[in-house]
């Protein structure tokens, strides 16, 4: 039994970190693997982490953690039994994956303005709450071509955009994600969809 | 309530030896690991020794290795010092304290302190 | 072995004004967590900061830490009465916990 791609490892910079890796064969991840993780930090204790199957060779992990900070380091171990297959280590801070906003919604109700609103995914002590920037992707139903991203540089977790600038009668989805550029993070994972039926009034021609 | 409680501390001998306990309440022992600070008279805090949650990894400053040898009972919540071949400058309060992962090292809860005195 | 240097060693200001303490590291410390403390004349050591800048639970928010690398500061943005005493940082790292002499914050 062989590690044929090594562990990778993102963290929520909060509580979980995901590990993947695969092996060189078709491996049932639970029963055959676990993966040791041990916080670099005088008298830690280690913990042990029961991975599961993704795909035929491929395994993941989720390590829980007590919070995150920037100099946290961890050593890694992956055994079989016995055999220890694969050494390594992982500093949270240099591979964060936010989690995703929560919550979208969007108003309609603002004269002829959507307001769309999210909830960020970090409570207020956590650093991240303060330092995530997001993207709104729009799209319709009805027209493939119809699909647009909105870029939010700001910290509320709020896009206002003119009804008109979305055809009128028709159905649009929104989702949003977000990033972090003090950890140079990747993107989170996209947020559920929601659904509105976009109307406004079309302004009377001036003649 | 979170408390610690220490005793065992007393007047000595140099040479001779001594064992503090400390008590834990109001928290599981066997969750954290714990340590023990000194701090002489009239001067600041100095790290002694320190024991992981289960008891299976020890730490020592160089100023008492091979002389002090930490331990814990988890099971009755309590950390133990024994210590030997006392000299004048081990002369100090003891604290016994708790360290949180959550909290990288920082020692979240600290006891009153035993006093040890080393003079002939 | 790494040394914690803190400085002034005494720290005279009035109650309301802003106090800047101190802590330096002998080597980069980036791999492992300053903490700070307070303690009172015949009293046990309080944690107030960890991981460098992080609070600990019910202190208030002028209590502020900051640093990295090998210069570390303790800010009291307001002084209260309370807040005299004399101030400890100290690191703990994957094989050794140190630290610094100390910092007396007296009034003025």
């Known amino acids: 039994m062989k590690v044929l791609q090594e562990p990778t490892c993102v963290s929520d910079y909060m509580s979980i970190s995901t590990c993947e890796w695969k092996m060189n064969g078709p491996t049932n991840c639970s029963t055959e693997l676990r993966l040791l993780y041990q916080l670099v930090f005088l008298l830690s204790e280690a913990h042990t982490c029961i991975p599961e199957n993704n795909g035929g060779a491929g395994c993941v992990c989720h390590l829980l953690m007590d919070d995150v900070v920037s100099a946290d380091n961890y050593t890694l171990d992956l055994w079989a039994g016995q055999q220890l297959l694969w050494k390594g280590s992982f500093k949270p801070s240099e591979h964060v994956k936010p989690r995703a906003p929560g919550n979208l919604t969007v108003h309609t109700n603002v004269s002829d303005t959507l307001l769309l609103t999210w909830s960020n995914p970090y409570p207020p002590d956590n650093y991240l709450y303060n330092h995530l920037t997001y993207a709104v992707n729009i799209w319709s139903e009805n027209d493939p071509a119809d699909f647009r991203i909105y870029n939010v540089t700001y910290l509320e977790p709020s896009l206002r955009i003119a009804a008109s600038t979305l055809k009128s009668g028709i159905s649009y989805r929104a989702r949003v994600r977000a990033w972090a550029q003090c950890y140079n993070t990747t993107w989170s994972e996209w947020s559920p969809s929601t659904k509105w039926h976009n109307s406004y009034r079309e302004p009377f021609e001036q003649h | 309530e979170v408390q610690l409680l220490e005793s065992g501390g007393g007047l000595v001998q140099p040479g001779g030896s001594l064992r503090l306990s400390c008590a834990a309440s109001g928290f599981t022992l066997s969750s954290y690991a714990m340590h023990w600070v000194r701090q002489a008279p009239g001067k600041g805090l100095e790290y002694v020794s320190g024991i992981s949650h289960s008891g299976t990894s020890t730490y020592y400053a160089n100023s008492v290795k091979g002389r002090f040898t930490i331990s814990r009972d988890n099971p009755k919540n309590t950390l133990f010092l024994q210590m030997s071949s006392l000299r004048a400058e081990d002369t100090a309060v003891y604290y016994c304290v708790r360290v949180r992962v959550l909290y990288r090292g920082g020692m979240d809860v600290w006891g009153q302190g035993t006093t040890v005195t080393v003079s002939s | 072995e790494i040394v914690l240097t803190q400085s002034p060693g005494t720290l005279s200001l009035s109650p309301g004004e802003r106090a800047t303490l101190s802590c330096r590291a002998s080597q980069d410390v980036s791999s492992a967590y300053l903490a700070w403390y307070q303690q009172k004349p015949g009293q046990a050591p309080r944690l107030l900061i960890y991981g460098t800048s992080r609070r600990a639970t019910g202190i208030p928010d002028r209590f502020s830490g900051s640093g990295s690398g090998t210069d570390f500061t303790l800010t009291i943005s307001r002084l209260e009465p309370e807040d005299f005493a004399v101030y400890y940082c100290?690191?703990?790292?994957?094989?050794?916990?140190?630290f610094g002499q100390g910092t007396k914050l007296e009034i003025k």
């Open positions: 100290q690191l703990y790292g994957a094989t050794s916990v140190t």
